[in-house]
């Protein structure tokens, strides 16, 4: 008979299955212990209350145990990300138990029905964990639930229902529709495990957000702002004009969370770091590259346990493919203007020269506008490790290369028609590396020539470690 559960009545009543297959579905959730990296190896199905398969399949009671929980499916077959994740976990944690939670019968439904089935699947996982806890040496502390999309909320339910506290839950782009703004007991939340870390890769403030936008863990990481992922634009996924749809873009961005996690498992030597910040815009301005007071963390599997009183939103930039790591730099440029130039929107580029390599020409993204006679902060990032920075080339783009730039030039000219000699003065650039936290100051190569105008460039050489110059008073506002 169905198990009654709490105030909401019988769990079995929550199963939303097409009538045609109602009789077929028993059990609705299977636990497949993946005993090999080889996806063709069928693994072992664990059965609640039956200890023999645990012994036959070599379940290691003292080792870490990963439960991988898939999400909604339109195909009824496991997508390749799951195979990649299983393989990566086996590579990284050779003795670990890797269990795939197969809830395809309940996930291969209308999305709304699959959502309504998440609770019962979470309960099934909790029951399996409760049973395993009865065994000697098995500890919930060693359990790590990894849920993708709808599976992240299933993991939340499992963590909520289990007797005791699961060691860790990782939410890989937890599903947004029907969960955004939901009560904490009806979605993944920080109290579902001792440590809940979340990667958000497909959040949208307009249109349908496939991934949840709100923070739902102890740490919530938003790679590339949590929305547009590099390598997932229409141009990137089309491959050829004959192929590709918006669906592919959605899949690419949503699934990126899984690949970032896989990357953290297999590219241990190239960890990606995220930085705490109140919002994406502040991060884009380069304001948030601090590691003080736990303000930065590795992402994915290597994330350090942080149990904050409130959610910690963290940001980073990534490459378009594995390894995803980039090197973040905060650049503080004090812009002097000796002429009243009105509103000006220069297009600046920098090239960084280091002991290991030189960067490409990198745009300085102006999030709002350049403040004159003030310090402007920018974020730049490189795909390669440049080593110690030696010099910086700053270029003000000259001839307009886009209609937008042409419009900016025209607007600037119309506002200041009698001021053709547009010119800014920059004496030095302060740089902070996000990855090393090292601060450097770069001074204009020619102290007599610190002016820059469209189509011109300035060179800066490292003139000291740290930021404070001689004869300089301490800044009144400390950046985080």
């Amino acid at each position: 008979s169905p198990t009654p559960f709490g105030p909401e009545g019988q769990l079995e009543d929550e199963l939303h299955k097409p009538k045609a297959i109602q009789t077929e579905v028993k059990p609705s959730v299977r636990f497949n212990l993946r005993t090999s990296k080889d996806p063709e190896h069928e693994g072992c199905y664990l059965s609640l209350g039956h200890s023999q398969p645990l012994e036959d399949c070599g379940f290691n009671m003292t080792a870490k145990t990963f439960f991988i929980i898939h999400g909604w499916t339109m195909s009824g077959i496991f997508e390749n990300w799951l195979h990649k994740l299983v393989s990566a976990l086996h590579t990284r944690e050779k003795d670990a138990n890797v269990v795939v939670v197969d809830w395809l019968p309940l996930a291969h439904q209308l999305y709304t029905d699959a959502v309504n089935n998440t609770r019962v699947v979470g309960h099934s996982i909790a029951r399996m964990l409760d049973w395993l806890q009865e065994k000697d040496d098995f500890s919930l502390e060693n359990v790590h639930l990894i849920g993708y999309s709808l599976g992240a909320h299933v993991a939340g339910y499992a963590g909520n229902f289990v007797k005791g506290t699961v060691g860790r839950i990782t939410g890989l782009d937890p599903a947004g529709p029907m969960f955004e703004g939901a009560d904490i007991h009806k979605r993944l939340s920080p109290d579902d495990a001792d440590f809940v870390d979340v990667l958000h890769t497909y959040t949208r403030s307009f249109g349908l957000s496939i991934g949840i936008q709100m923070p739902v863990g102890h740490i919530d990481i938003y790679p590339n702002g949590g929305d547009f992922q590099p390598g997932c634009g229409l141009n990137d996924v089309l491959g050829s004009m004959a192929y590709g749809t918006i669906t592919e873009v959605v899949k690419c961005e949503h699934e990126r969370a899984v690949h970032l996690f896989v990357d953290s498992l297999v590219n241990q030597d190239k960890p990606s770091f995220a930085f705490q910040c109140t919002d994406s815009n502040r991060f884009k301005k380069g304001i948030c590259l601090s590691c003080r007071k736990n303000r930065c963390n590795s992402i994915g599997y290597n994330a350090k346990k942080m149990r904050n009183k409130r959610n910690s939103k963290m940001y980073l930039k990534t490459r378009a493919g594995m390894p995803f790591r980039v090197y973040h730099y905060q650049m503080k440029i004090h812009v002097f203007s000796y002429k009243n130039m009105g509103e000006i929107e220069p297009t600046f580029y920098v090239t960084l020269y280091g002991t290991n390599a030189d960067s490409q020409t990198l745009p300085l993204e102006i999030v709002e506008r350049i403040e004159q006679n003030a310090t402007n902060t920018f974020l730049v990032y490189t795909e390669e490790d440049l080593g110690d920075l030696l010099k910086i080339q700053l270029t003000w783009e000259g001839a307009s290369q886009s209609w937008y730039n042409l419009w900016k030039e025209l607007r600037s000219y119309l506002s200041q028609p009698h001021n053709p000699g547009r010119e800014l003065n920059i004496r030095r650039i302060r740089v902070k590396s996000g990855e090393t936290q090292r601060k450097l100051t770069f001074c204009a190569e020619d102290p007599e020539n610190t002016s820059i105008s469209p189509g011109r460039e300035l060179w800066f050489r490292k003139c000291r470690d740290g930021w404070r110059m001689k004869n300089e008073t301490s800044p009144t506002v400390e950046l985080p």
């Epitope: 063709e40 069928e42 496991f78 799951l82 195979h83 019968p105 291969h108 996924v237």
Partner: antibody
Framework: EVQLQQSGPELLKPGASVKISCKAS????????IHWVKQSHGKSLEWIGH????????NNNEKFKDKATLTVDKSSSTAYMELRSLTSEDSAIYYC?????????????WGQGTTLTVSS | DIQMTQTTSSLSASLGDRVTISCRAS??????LNWYQQKPDGTVKLLIS???KLHSGVPSRFSGSGSGTDYSLTISNLEREDFATYFC?????????FGSGTNLEIK
């Protein structure tokens, strides 16, 4: 030994329907998926769709959505494909094939094929 | 849908020869490429999965390689039973698609 045994050849008139069977043996039927593939005369192979015998969930190639219906009978470890509103375009060899649980899993064992001829 | 192209529809070779059959995908398929052999009687067998993994029971003279969009199947020392038609198939994205086949004939 894994085996997929398909039903015999069929000769049918346009507009008719046919149900081809594929009996699996030598493995646990619910641990893999069954896929159907069409090969028109002297042509390449076309994936029609698959069924997950564990719960009966199916997914068809858009091209065959209105043509093929896939079912299973777990008690006899048999998969079926029904083709409706037959036309001469449906004349082909139809194969069932076993596949693992991932997209990327290959079709590791194939039935011997069922020849369907549609002619008035 | 991902298009799989086998440019050589027919290939003639002699016993003992080494032959290479190629297959190109219309986009990156992340090494999720499988090769099949179809005998004249219609029997289909899996030879290679995941670009280069030999299926159990398949002779070691068969090998596969490639990445991204370009893949190939090599038969190093042709034997009589190898004369057949060879198909590639991608397992990266639904719907699964096959190449048009390469018929290997005795010279």
């Amino acid at each position: 030994e894994v085996q997929l045994q398909q039903s015999g050849p069929e000769l049918l008139k346009p507009g008719a329907s046919v149900k081809i069977s594929c009996k699996a043996s030598g493995y646990t039927f619910t641990d893999n998926t069954i896929h159907w593939v069409k090969q028109s005369h002297g042509k390449s192979l076309e994936w029609i769709g698959h069924i997950n015998p564990y719960y009966g969930g199916t997914n068809n190639n858009e091209k065959f959505k209105d043509k093929a219906t896939l079912t299973v009978d777990k008690s006899s470890s048999t998969a079926y494909m029904e083709l409706r509103s037959l036309t001469s375009e449906d004349s082909a060899i139809y194969y069932c094939a076993r596949k693992g649980i991932y997209y990327s899993s290959p079709f590791d064992y194939w039935g011997q094929g069922t020849t369907l001829t549609v002619s008035s | 849908d991902i298009q799989m192209t086998q440019t050589t529809s027919s290939l003639s070779a002699s016993l003992g020869d080494r032959v290479t059959i190629s297959c190109r995908a219309s986009q990156d398929i992340n090494n999720y490429l499988n090769w099949y052999q179809q005998k004249p009687d219609g029997t289909v067998k899996l030879l290679i999965s995941y670009t280069s993994k030999l299926h159990s029971g398949v002779p070691s003279r068969f090998s596969g390689s490639g990445s991204g969009t370009d893949y190939s199947l090599t038969i190093s020392n042709l034997e009589r039973e190898d004369f057949a038609t060879y198909f590639c198939q991608q397992g990266n994205t639904l719907p699964f698609t096959f190449g048009s086949g390469t018929n290997l004939e005795i010279k």
